[in-house]
């Protein structure tokens, strides 16, 4: 039986500062049950970018409808893109647990660049 | 067309076992969660149980006496009760989960269920 | 664990007229709530998820709103096979997963 895999096709992305940056993410399987969040930077002192359960991420939507079922597209768009905003992207599976969830498997991380903007 | 077809309900005494299957058809079975809900008589619904791959999750009221398996080579879910009580008197279903994006859990198809009566 | 608390327990409805009924959850659960039918004698069957969305093949007359802590389910026009229990379930915070007591809707 194939365990579930996070796949993140683009190593890394560039994206000119003010337009938008599509992170593109997808899992091979439905199980384990559990959660999918992404996250920038890796370990201890990682940024949650997102996480539809909990939170306020106004910059960010998915492109998938959050009402579409048996989804296995994860991928986001992060709006209004600064020089700040570079960096690793990780999409990230959990395991439902009680009372918290575990990390399950990670994506090979996409890294976020940003060009000036255009003149 | 997804079928599940639930067996091995029947009447046993407090302290027994009893072992639930479900056969499952007409989906993929190994990629999706499935799950038992049980319903006294004349009562409502109550989860008992979920599956994913190696993820089990349990009611409180059952823990330590249900085990929820699978086995995706012949597309069955199984029960396997221990130490009944009177209070396990229930019609059990089994359903597959579905989940709408980002989010948990619902049923989308059920069995028709199977009576398990325990009774002295 | 969060609790589901449906009303009324009973709704007795004429043939042809609409019936309304609720599910209030004890904390939010967003949008994260289905809605079953029970028919005497058989297994439940989805209706409506993701508080507002008609399941595959269900008629147009079954409709869900609401988000947060208060839902409802609204039949226009009940037909007789309407006549039987609905469950609301909340899939936002579990385990466990949580159903409602059921609304019983019988023929006036």
């Known amino acids: 039986e194939d365990e579930l895999q996070v796949i993140q096709p683009e190593k890394s992305v560039s994206v000119a500062a003010g337009e938008s940056a599509t992170l593109r993410c997808a899992m091979t399987s439905l199980i384990p049950v559990g959660p999918i969040m992404w996250f920038r930077g890796a370990g201890a002192g990682r940024e949650l970018i997102y996480n539809q359960k909990e939170g306020h991420f106004p910059r960010v939507t998915t492109v998938s409808e959050l009402t579409k079922r048996n989804n296995l597209d994860f991928s986001i768009s992060i709006s209004n893109i600064t020089p700040a905003d570079a960096g690793t992207y990780y999409c990230v599976k959990f395991r439902k647990g009680s009372p918290d969830d575990v990390e399950f498997k990670s994506g090979a991380g996409t890294e976020l660049s940003v060009r000036a903007k255009p003149s | 067309d997804v079928q599940l077809v639930e067996s091995g309900g029947g009447v046993v005494r407090p302290g027994e076992s009893l072992r639930l299957s479900c056969a499952a058809s007409?989906?993929?079975?190994?990629?999706?969660?499935m799950t038992w809900v049980r319903q006294a008589p004349g009562e409502g619904l109550e989860w008992v149980s979920t599956?994913?791959?190696?993820?089990?999750y349990y009611a409180d009221s059952v823990k330590g006496r249900f085990t929820i398996s699978r086995d995706n080579s012949k597309n069955t879910l199984y029960l396997q009760m221990n130490s009944l009580r009177a209070e396990d008197t229930a019609v059990y279903y089994c359903?597959?989960?579905?989940?709408?994006?980002?989010?948990?859990?619902?049923?989308?198809?059920w069995g028709l269920g199977t009576l398990v009566t325990v009774s002295s | 664990e969060i609790v589901l608390t449906q009303s009324p327990a009973t709704l007795s409805v004429s043939p042809g007229e609409r019936a309304t009924f609720s599910c209030r959850a004890s904390?939010?659960?967003?949008?994260?709530l289905a809605w079953y039918q029970q028919r005497p004698g058989q297994a439940p069957r989805l209706l409506i998820y993701?508080?507002?969305i008609r399941e595959t093949g269900i008629p147009e007359r079954f409709s869900g709103s609401g988000s947060g802590t208060e839902f409802t389910l609204t039949i226009t026009s009940l037909q007789s096979e309407d006549f039987a229990v609905y469950y609301c379930?909340?899939?936002?915070?579990?385990?466990?997963?949580?159903f409602g007591g059921g609304t019983k809707v019988e023929i006036k």
């Open positions: 359903a597959k989960d579905s989940t709408v994006s980002w989010s948990g859990d619902f049923f989308d198809y």
């Open positions: 007409g989906f993929r079975f190994s990629n999706f969660a």
């Open positions: 599956i994913g791959s190696g993820d089990t």
């Open positions: 904390q939010n659960v967003k949008n994260d």
């Open positions: 993701a508080a507002r």
């Open positions: 379930q909340q899939y936002y915070d579990w385990p466990p997963f949580t």
